[in-house]
């Protein structure tokens, strides 16, 4: 369970890939689209509000083998919209929603090498936000392999 309903901290940051492509958000036909692209030098990077929550649970309850605290994050690029995992479609989507947010909006934060981070679906352990064909997608990572695959690594810059 997530400890408390309010985040322990929040920060505004731009999100980019390991290869320094920017994650951008565009309003199209009354819905938001998410792009992974090289930004022109003069273009301002989109900022995302990251809200961090503590999650505390015994492994027997979570089923993910973790027996202590984890750091969960939600990502909101604009008011009332949050990134959400669509596990059926293996996609990452922006949805308008009210609090309390659904579990699909929560991701377990992993600190990685090179000061990168990864975002693992709360609803589907072993599945991470990643980059596929210049879009964000859900990517299953085999836990028997090293989790260092570059397409699930992101950089946060405030």
């Amino acid at each position: 369970s997530i400890t408390g309903i309010s985040p322990i901290t929040e920060s505004l940051a731009s999100l980019s890939t390991y290869n320094d492509q920017s994650i951008t958000f565009a309003l199209e036909d009354e819905s938001y689209e998410i792009y992974v692209e090289d930004l022109k030098k003069d273009k301002k990077k989109d900022k995302v509000l990251l809200s961090y929550y503590e999650s505390q649970h015994p492994s027997s309850e979570s089923g993910d083998g973790v027996d202590g605290k984890m750091l969960m994050v939600t990502l909101s690029p604009t008011k009332d919209f949050w990134l959400q995992a669509n596990n059926k479609e293996h996609s990452v989507e922006l949805h308008k929603c009210e609090k309390p947010l659904p579990d699909q909006a929560f991701f377990v934060l992993h600190n990685r090498s090179f000061n990168c981070v990864s975002f693992e679906c709360k609803t589907d352990p072993g599945v991470f936000i990643g980059v596929k064909d210049n879009h964000l997608a859900l990517i299953k990572v085999d836990y028997s392999e090293n989790l260092g695959s570059e397409n699930i690594l992101f950089k946060l810059s405030e």
């Epitope: 605290k69 750091l71 992993h110 600190n111 836990y143």
Partner: antibody
């Protein structure tokens, strides 16, 4: 219970190497990174590096790059820190330490070994 | 690397006193700052994480505040067991870095 048990004190000559072990128990070993922090007599805390026990990837402080090697044995839930080309300034207590959150160091380090005193003297 | 400047390096205080320790970082670290207490011959003990969250089991007389580059640890009413050395540590990026420490001594 959740604990980190370190190997015993060592006395080494300058130029030698030392290998300190840290055995974890009471938690899911591969879900938490393991950090090494040292403290010279009467001095402050100095971060040396981290190993991810899941894949074995490492991050070392620049100061120790080329002299330090961190490894792990998942079958025994043990991590090792080897420091080579020892000099007198390496005399310190060496701690292994686990972050309070799985997968992340953002929430600080809440589990520490008792420390291993390494004395470098000719 | 992020530099950590902790002040004062030592403070003399009496039981019941309010003690404030500050930590300044060379660049913004959001709220990713931890505070530790260390007693002679012992390993450090985590007191505060994420700048202001109290670690489980730590007395409520300890509190933390700040974000960005300026942070504070406050002990509202010093107790005999609080005489120790306190360290701040940034947890924002690797390498993790520590402040130089503040020794809280009996006046």
């Amino acid at each position: 219970q959740v604990q980190l048990v370190q190997s015993g004190a060592e006395v080494k000559k300058p130029g030698a190497s030392v290998k300190v072990s840290c055995k974890a128990s009471g938690y899911t070993f591969i879900s938490y990174g393991m950090h090494w922090v040292r403290q010279a007599p009467g001095q402050g805390l100095e971060w040396m590096g981290e190993i991810n026990p899941h894949g074995g990837s490492t991050s070392y402080a620049q100061k120790f790059q080329g002299r330090v090697t961190m490894t792990r044995d998942t079958s025994t839930s043990t991590v090792y820190m080897e420091l080579s080309s020892l000099r007198s300034e390496d005399t310190a207590v060496y701690y292994c330490a686990r972050p309070s959150a799985a997968y992340s160091h953002y929430l600080g380090i809440d589990l520490w070994g008792r420390g291993t005193l390494v004395t470098v003297s000719s | 690397d992020i530099q950590m400047t902790q002040s004062p390096s030592s403070v003399s205080a009496s039981v019941g006193d309010r003690v404030t320790i500050t930590c300044r970082t060379s660049q913004g670290i959001s709220s990713w700052l931890s505070w530790y207490q260390q007693k002679p011959g012992k390993a450090p003990k985590l007191l505060i994480y994420a700048a202001s969250s109290l670690q489980s089991g730590v007395p409520s007389r300890f509190s933390g505040s700040g974000s960005g580059t300026d942070f504070t640890l406050t002990i509202s009413s010093l107790q005999p067991e609080d005489f120790a050395t306190y360290y701040c540590q940034q947890a924002h990026v690797l390498p993790l870095t520590f402040g130089g420490g503040t020794k809280v001594e009996i006046k």
